[in-house]
């Protein structure tokens, strides 16, 4: 999160997270500015001349949707300033002189999660935004799966699923005869060879995907796919 010291009696803490494509969602902790003040955040690119993007706060939140030509790249770097009007005059305070979107990533959840049941196993596949495909090797997934009648808190988890958009669940991991549900979330992976800490992508898990339901297959011998395990 990004903390900006305000001009008033209380400081403001802003958290701005990006989906690593075209959207930056910001949330702030001190929305009480009075009626009609219409505060906003201004993102000014430290690299692209004239690259400014306005984020108008509604309550405690705002969203910037960047133009298509400004799709986020790893080296992007913004100055964030907070603007509001008091007594008819615009007040400006610095929130962050060097906001690096790659350090504040919250991706959109994976989409189109599907199951394909065959003898002895279930193959799960999913999709990511085409805009993220160049970063496939940087994406890490976590799978949660459970019997349909169970709460998600009871789900089994599998993580460290990196760089693939499929997964095999063996029948022995599931309860035969029961309908199961699975869901998935994604984050930027921390790679072993990322020796320069400043260059890493960091952030948090996406929201969970829409779940998929499937009937557990009958148990047989383990399947070893020709392409190896993920």
């Amino acid at each position: 999160s990004v903390t900006g010291e305000g001009q008033g009696p209380r400081s403001r803490t802003f958290t701005c997270l990006t989906n690593n494509i075209l959207r930056i969602d910001c949330h702030w902790s001190a929305p009480e500015l009075g009626q009609g003040s219409s505060p906003w955040l201004l993102f000014t690119s430290n690299q692209a001349p004239g690259g400014t993007h306005k984020c108008i706060l509604r309550g405690s939140e705002c969203t910037v949707v960047l133009p298509p030509e400004a799709v986020l790249v790893p080296s992007d770097n913004f100055t964030i300033t907070f603007h509001h009007c008091m007594s008819g005059r615009e007040q400006v305070s610095l929130v962050d002189p060097e906001y690096l979107p790659r350090r504040h990533v919250k991706l959109d959840p994976p989409s189109d999660l599907q199951s394909n049941i065959s003898s002895g196993h279930c193959i799960l596949t999913w999709s990511i935004s085409p805009a993220l495909e160049p970063m496939t090797t940087l994406l890490s997934y976590e799978l949660a799966f459970k019997k349909q009648e169970e709460a998600w808190e009871q789900a089994q988890h599998r993580d460290h699923i990196v760089g693939v958009t499929w997964l095999i669940l063996e029948a022995f991991e599931l309860d035969p005869g029961f309908i199961h549900e699975a869901r998935l979330r994604v984050q930027m992976a921390t790679l072993e060879d990322d020796v320069v800490e400043e260059e890493r992508y960091t952030g948090q898990w996406s929201e969970w995907s829409q779940p998929v339901c499937f009937q557990a297959p009958q148990r047989q011998g383990p399947l070893i796919p020709p392409w190896g395990w993920p």
Epitope: P68, E69, V71, A131, P134, M135, T137
Partner: nanobody, 125 residues
Amino acid sequence: QVQLVESGGGLVQAGGSLRLSCAASGRYFYTYGMGWFRQAPGKEREFVAAISNEGGSTYYADSVKGRFTISRDNAKNTVYLQMNSLKPEDTAVYYCAAGRWYYYGPEYQITYRYWGQGTQVTVSS
């Protein structure tokens, strides 16, 4: 910031060959689509060729198809343009560009965020 440095330009006779290189700095080179553009004197900068981040897709202007080949080596952070059967009308300054393809196609300059300084290619008849 991604920095791009072109090399390999020069003077060549018509029918000859040149290989341009573009060396990129930056940790995430393999996430960028790369393109070559050129600008002849008195003309606008035009698309020549492009290659996707992993190298699996390539794109060419009609005027260079079959003569030019774009390739990349992500381990070396370098993209190449092999130019064969050069013609006098290929004379131009050649620019390397890097961008994250999203909305606009690889032939559009607006797709590219970073540009090199250019290398001169002169084809004499």
